[in-house]
Interface confidence: low
Amino acid sequence: EDELQVIQPEKSVSVAAGESATLRCAMTSLIPVGPIMWFRGAGAGRELIYNQKEGHFPRVTTVSELTKRNNLDFSISISNITPADAGTYYCVKFRKGSPDDVEFKSGAGTELSVRAKPSAPVVSGPAVRATPEHTVSFTCESHGFSPRDITLKWFKNGNELSDFQTNVDPAGDSVSYSIHSTARVVLTRGDVHSQVICEIAHITLQGDPLRGTANLSEAIRVPPTLEVTQQPMRAENQANVTCQVSNFYPRGLQLTWLENGNVSRTETASTLIENKDGTYNWMSWLLVNTCAHRDDVVLTCQVEHDGQQAVSKSYALEISAHQKEHGSDITHEAALAPTAPL
């Protein structure tokens, strides 16, 4: 009579995490008498998965009734598969012995691979803001996926980026993997409304990639431009000087007026005008009583934006010779002449 063969027809089986895995095994003979066992791995380190003879294996069910007369099917189903279940499973026939059963023959093994979805990608930007023309780094992380093969792409406003580096860990075999990618993005003045997207494609996602996003508004600081001008006034002894603060981001801004270097007024920007590109404008004005000055006045508009070092623009308000002579009787308009910024 032909010697018993242990047949494991499938070399490999792939299952999604959470599903059940069916591992098939058949014998070609009822002889010799003895139990079958399923193991994960081979050699000394193998792990018992199912023992026909004894033990409690709550996740394992047999596909057919093993006690049924002439049964030769020893397939099993393992429920609620996780990545930790990946490995090669062996169906092993034992020969009844005394005191212990003796291993008789093993199947060729079935490799179980577990498909586990990557976690939602988490994108994080730089810890501190940077100004346009500078490069900032964004990182993207996703964990817990299997198998190892995965594709990651970066986009900025729909345009694919090429300056990034990606690692999949660990390098060797593992039950599940993590991906970490760092992209370098050059900021432009119009990036307040821009977005970076990290897109991950994996076999478990069936063509529907996962995306993580980050807004460049969290990473950019657009410094303001200042313009000081004099507005026409009806009252002859007053000058209305405005400081136009333009195209800044984020909102946080404090403005100080100085007259000849002395603080005249400090205010915090409140009612801002938002531009189409997401930056803000703001205007502050200072009313100068020209009759109180016998000499020219240097007016400085000083702006502290987003906790950075203050920037300023100064203008000389010229008091005319006639006005200097007659004090408050003067009827001529004071002239405003720009000076270089301080």
Partner: antibody, heavy 119, light 107 residues
Framework: QVQLVQSGAEVKKPGASVKVSCKAS????????MHWVRQVPGQGLEWMGW????????KYSQKFQGRVTITRDTSATTAYMELSSLRSEDTAVYYC????????????WGKGTTVTVSS | DIQVTQSPSSLSASVGDRVTITCRAS??????LNWYQQKPGKAPKLLIH???SLQNGVPSRFSGSGSGTDFSLTINSLQPEDFATYYC?????????FGGGTKVEIK
């Protein structure tokens, strides 16, 4: 580079216990097993047990069952072997060795820790 | 438990000789057999794993063969640094076990 650094030599009295440490570096500690093997002077190698550093699974040789305890601290990347109820025949060099997870060969060994049991 | 019997327990050879050490397991262990070299006062060093796979960094004059119950380690053209004790080890089932060792001495 991959290395295993063991604790220093110990002299113990019969009935006492000894705990030997093995600090791993240069590889992912949890990706391998750690074996403990001893060698009595002038004799061959004797396997005592292993610990799978990843999941903590332990297997002891029946000969040492009940007297040996193998543990690991993954944060310190260190394995430990404690042998209790020492007798004079436990005088030996105790080695830790990194183990492969499939063929269970031992590819990196510590230099050994000499344990002398004497009254 | 699986017993591993190594032979001979010692042998004398000269530099340049071809030396073969054998190892027999008490039951079939497929290819779960490894070979180690140990010099006095030193830790063992892995030479061959899985019966015939040469460990990284080990000279190619060392080779292993066998499957099932009978295995051998061959050193082609023995070098002065090869005089040492050699052990085989089965890793098919626990307890893992070593052969008794073969001491290779200078003739």
């Amino acid at each position: 580079q991959v290395q295993l650094v063991q604790s220093g030599a110990e002299v113990k009295k019969p009935g006492a216990s000894v705990k030997v440490s093995c600090k791993a570096s240069g590889y992912t500690f949890t990706s391998n097993a750690m074996h403990w093997v001893r060698q009595v002077p002038g004799q061959g190698l004797e396997w005592m047990g292993w610990i799978k550093a990843g999941n903590g699974e332990i297997k002891y040789s029946q000969k040492f069952q009940g007297r040996v305890t193998i543990t690991r601290d993954t944060s310190a990347t260190t394995a430990y072997m404690e042998l209790s109820s020492l007798r004079s025949e436990d005088t030996a060099v105790y080695y830790c060795a990194r183990g492969d997870y499939y063929y269970y060969y031992m590819d990196v060994w510590g230099k050994g820790t000499t344990v002398t049991v004497s009254s | 438990d699986i017993q591993v019997t190594q032979s001979p327990s010692s042998l004398s050879a000269s530099v340049g000789d071809r030396v073969t050490i054998t190892c027999r397991a008490s039951q079939s262990i497929s290819d779960f057999l490894n070979w180690y070299q140990q010099k006095p006062g030193k830790a063992p060093k892995l030479l061959i794993h899985a019966a015939s796979s040469l460990q990284n960094g080990v000279p190619s004059r060392f080779s292993g063969s066998g499957s099932g119950t009978d295995f051998s380690l061959t050193i082609n053209s023995l070098q002065p640094e090869d005089f040492a004790t050699y052990y085989c080890q089965q890793s098919y089932s626990t307890p893992l076990s070593f052969g008794g060792g073969t001491k290779v001495e200078i003739k």
